[in-house]
Interface confidence: low
């Protein structure tokens, strides 16, 4: 009886038609750009307030006749997926509708950055509590557009928008590709990524995210009771956008990052089939499908981190990929990898007063990635320390030799073209986990970290023959912020995290063959905060009596037994 | 089109004698740069928006608009603001000939300018 | 005037399903959910759920999510409820009762008779 | 589930007295978007269907005696009659609104 995409969105141990409250969301104002919307909608009256803005262009066509039905549909639907009263998935938002798609559901980016303006001044004229701006449309790659969203996001506002509806990458349109929009992509009730008639979702490393997005059950502009099902990625981002509602209705002081986290944090992982996706775009696309958090209490001692995968660099023989984390996030470690096994691997350095990871081509190299693993780590001081290349045969080392400073990542960068597979010793010296080993031919980058009650370990996997793929997961309770491979030879086609996990990937065996070279050992360095832990408990303590609702209070957990693995 | 003519005229006789007194040249070393969409079928040529630096004022970008202008009609071409950017983005829109883009990637202020492009419902 | 008209008293016996119908006057059919609500001999008032006749949405209470099935007739103006697998447990008077649809409104202004539902062997 | 819990659960009064039920909820029921407690107040009268009385807490139904009064908020309910009349005596039921649907227990109200 209840629709499965919002069965779909809640946590596996609770039933959608508890966990969703008439309140849920009722501290949050979302905007909508898009079509104009049948306000007086049973799902949506009450709830959207349309604006006077209007910027779209003429319809195509000199036999286009203007029905309000038609013109009102796709904004209708999304506004009843985000707050309807039966098909809603944050049933309390507000709505402010902004007409920048036309009857035909077309519309420009120039009249997009004039309604991203409009709501900016809005903000500033009547500031309320946290904004959410749904935007389910998409246009080619726009650095004009980017740039706008770039500067809402800066001032505060959460922006969630459509991957796109044209199985492509999602790099490759607006404002999909801006890094500071949570980007959403479309599955099914199947876990699968949703098609389109020839067509389908976009994927990639610009997309955040996976939220349902086909056969959608939501309000039809037909009638005001009438409901209809749609389909796309801009049903996939409306969920997103009640989804972070809802979380900040909980906890209104929530950051961008800190929600673009707790959104990762909380989605089902690893239920997606891979198989539908371009194969050189599986392993930059992420396998997540959205989920509400179990209780809006408890996260905040969570050690959130997330992998940002840069660009590719191409192919030529100096270039070089960069991977950034979000201003408010720390780099805790930078890892690269390239398909074709020639890279001269990745090193942390500062730019613009931030850390950045950049991967490095090698001669004869298709190219190159880096990848970086973002933390949110309050008061953390991180610094890279380097040794250069050892040139002696015990390889490279270096430690975190700061009182207080942890080590949270490793990273080795060779300026020979090919390490060999002088094979440096793998197991670093008992006594002394604060310390990276490398290549002796390679200069080896430790990310080192002091920030309260920041702990830290690292856990190895070795595998004695040679393997495509190895891989080490942190435990229960334990973020992953370090992944990296021993020993950094030339078989070894780089390392990444995926969620808690790190993976390293070699060349295919049959071209390594089985000598003991091939040897591969996954390098994990997993994290926990005791201070977020006792500053979440303190939180809570002082908030119990503040009368602030607590909107999923009536499926309160402890939070060491969720375990996010969908139905 | 009569209407249209009358305009022109105005804004040539409103505007030349304004143009003389703009005579800053864009900072050296920096060269504003050009976009448009990769896919052809979305482009709307003869609607820009030009970015203007981080830090401009709403004036200097009411001031390059008209500077802009001023140096279209100078050239014969008529041009159209539609919107001036502040609060976000500074900078504005206008509608204009290509033809001018050479001229107005080299007014001062000027970061890039985009040719404006459609977007769809997904 | 608005009135909720429901259908008589039932006997029946363990193992089988019932089914209860609750008539809608004076008023638009599709602007109200219908809930329905079970009060057991001599006990209190329990939800058991509800239908939203536009869109079809029904909600349950946990305890009577295998138990109650609500289903509405536009065209008549009617909602249903059926009960399966019926028990002794299942004894009690059952009632419909009208909300609007409104954000605000979560209250039941108008109910039906009630309908006894008894189940013995 | 929110959980209700009225008392007393069965009181015994006089005409013209003065009576107090009260409604505790286990979590709040105010709704901080539209600031107003989703409670309703309901009597019933042996062999009939419930009568709504209060709405939002505080708000009387139409048609409902200005006898009858709600008050509360957050978590603590009460049902107020301030002079019992002889159609008066029945059972009451608090009802939470906020997250689903939940009624209290009942309180009866019988003559002295």
């Known amino acids: 009886s209840i629709p499965w995409n919002l069965e779909r969105i809640t946590p596996p141990r609770y039933r959608a038609d508890e966990y969703q409250p008439p309140d849920g969301g009722s501290l949050v104002e979302v905007y909508l750009l898009d079509t104009s919307i049948q306000s007086d909608h049973r799902e949506i009256e009450g709830r959207v307030m349309v604006t006077d803005f209007e910027n779209v262009p003429e319809e195509d066509g000199t036999r286009f006749h203007r029905q309000a039905s038609k013109c009102d549909s796709h904004g209708t639907h999304l506004a009843g997926v985000v707050s309807g009263r039966d098909a809603g998935v944050a049933k309390g938002a507000s709505m402010r509708s902004l007409r920048v798609l036309n009857c035909q559901g077309k519309g420009t980016v120039s009249g997009t950055l004039i309604g991203l303006e409009f709501i900016r001044k809005s903000q500033l004229v009547q500031p309320v509590g946290p904004l959410v701006v749904l935007l389910p449309l998409a246009g080619g790659y726009s650095r004009v557009l980017n740039a706008a969203c770039q500067r809402l996001a800066r001032a505060g506002v959460v922006l969630v928008t459509a991957a796109g509806n044209f199985r492509d990458d999602a790099c490759l349109y607006s404002p999909a590709s801006a890094p500071e929009v949570i980007t959403v992509g479309a599955t099914n009730a199947q876990d699968q990524p949703v098609t389109l008639g020839t067509l389908g979702t976009n994927f990639g490393r610009c997309v955040d995210l996976f939220a349902p997005g086909e056969d959608i059950i939501g309000a039809s502009s037909d009638c005001s009771t009438c409901f209809v099902s749609q389909s796309g990625t801009s049903q996939a981002a409306a969920h997103v956008a009640g989804i972070a509602a809802m979380m900040l209705s909980a906890e209104p002081e929530l950051t961008l990052a800190e929600l673009r986290q707790r959104l990762i944090h909380f989605s089902a992982k690893d239920v997606i089939n891979e198989a539908w996706f371009p194969e050189d775009q599986r392993v930059l696309t992420p396998n997540l499908v959205a989920a509400l958090p179990p209780s809006t209490h408890g996260a905040g001692w969570q050690l959130f981190c997330r992998t940002v995968w840069s660009a590719h660099s191409g192919p030529t023989r100096m270039a070089t990929a960069v991977a950034r984390c979000a201003p408010d996030e720390e780099l805790l470690s930078c890892s690269s990898f390239s398909r074709s096994g020639k890279r001269r691997g990745e090193r942390m350095e500062a730019q613009g007063g931030k850390l950045v990871c950049r991967a490095h081509n090698a001669f004869g190299g298709e190219g190159v990635y880096a990848i970086a693993r973002c933390c949110l780590l309050p008061q953390a001081n991180c610094s890279v320390h380097t040794a250069p290349p050892a040139e002696a045969s015990m390889g490279t080392r270096v430690h975190c030799h700061q009182q207080g400073h942890v080590l949270t990542g490793c990273s080795s960068h060779w300026e020979v073209e090919d390490l060999g597979t002088h094979k440096p010793p793998v197991l670093r010296p008992r006594g002394q986990p604060n310390q990276c080993v490398g290549h002796r031919e390679a200069s080896i980058h430790a990310s080192c970290c002091h920030a309260p009650g920041l702990e830290c370990k690292v856990k190895e996997h070795g595998i004695p023959a040679p393997q495509e793929q190895v891989t080490v997961a942190c435990e229960e309770g334990w973020t992953l912020t370090g992944c990296s491979a021993l020993p950094g030879t030339s078989h070894v086609l780089g390392a990444y995290a995926v969620d808690n996990t790190c993976v390293v990937r070699s060349r295919d065996v049959s071209t390594t063959g089985s000598t003991s070279e091939g040897a591969v050992t996954a390098v994990a360095i997993c994290c926990r905060s005791r201070h977020l832990a006792q500053a979440s408990q303190e939180l809570q303590g002082s908030t119990s009596g503040s009368g602030l609702n607590d909107i999923f209070e009536a499926q309160k957990i402890e939070w060491h037994e969720h375990h996010h693995h969908h139905h | 089109q009569e209407d249209e003519d009358g305009d022109y005229e105005e804004l040539v006789l409103a505007l030349r004698s304004e143009e003389d007194g703009l005579a800053e040249a864009p900072e050296h070393g920096t060269t504003a740069t050009f976009h448009r969409c990769a896919k052809d079928p979305w482009r709307l040529p003869g609607t820009y928006v030009v970015v203007l630096k981080e830090e401009t004022h709403l004036s200097q970008s009411e001031r390059t608009a008209r500077r802009l202008q001023a140096q279209a009609a100078r050239r014969g071409y008529l041009t159209k603001i539609l919107h001036v950017f502040h609060g976000l983005l500074p900078g504005f829109l206008v509608k204009m000939s290509g033809d001018l883009l050479e001229l107005a990637l080299k007014l001062p202020h000027v970061d890039y300018i985009e040719e404006d492009s459609s977007v769809f419902a997904q | 005037q608005v009135q909720l008209v429901q259908s008589g008293a039932e006997v029946k016996k363990p193992g089988a399903s019932v089914k209860v119908s609750c008539k809608a006057s004076g008023y638009t059919f599709n602007d109200y959910w219908m809930h329905w609500v079970k009060q057991a001999p001599g006990q209190g008032l329990e939800w058991i759920g509800y239908i939203n006749p536009s869109s079809g949405f029904t909600k349950y209470h946990q305890n009577f999510k295998d138990k109650a099935t609500l289903t509405a007739d536009k065209s008549i103006s009617t909602a249903y409820m059926e009960l399966s697998r019926l028990t002794s447990d299942d004894t009690a008077v059952y009632y419909c009762?009208?909300?609007?649809?409104?954000?605000?409104?979560?209250?039941?202004?108008?109910w039906g008779q009630g309908t006894t539902v008894t189940v013995s062997s | 589930d929110i959980q209700m819990s009225q008392s007393p659960s069965s009181l015994s009064a006089s005409v013209g007295d003065r009576v107090t039920i009260t409604c505790k909820s286990s979590?709040?029921?105010?709704?901080?978007?539209?600031?107003?407690?989703?409670l309703a107040w309901y009597q019933q009268k042996p062999g009939k269907a419930p009568k709504l009385l209060i709405y939002w807490a505080s708000t009387r139904e139409s048609g409902v005696p200005d006898r009858f009064s709600g008050s509360g908020s957050g978590t603590d309910f009460t049902l107020t009659i301030s002079s019992l009349q002889p159609e008066d005596f029945a059972t009451y039921y608090c009802k939470q609104s906020f997250n689903l649907f939940t009624f209290g227990q009942g309180t009866k109200l019988e003559i002295k």
């Open positions: 009762a009208r909300q609007y649809d409104y954000d605000e409104d979560w209250y039941f202004d108008v």
């Open positions: 979590q709040s029921l105010l709704n901080s978007r539209t600031r107003k407690n989703f």
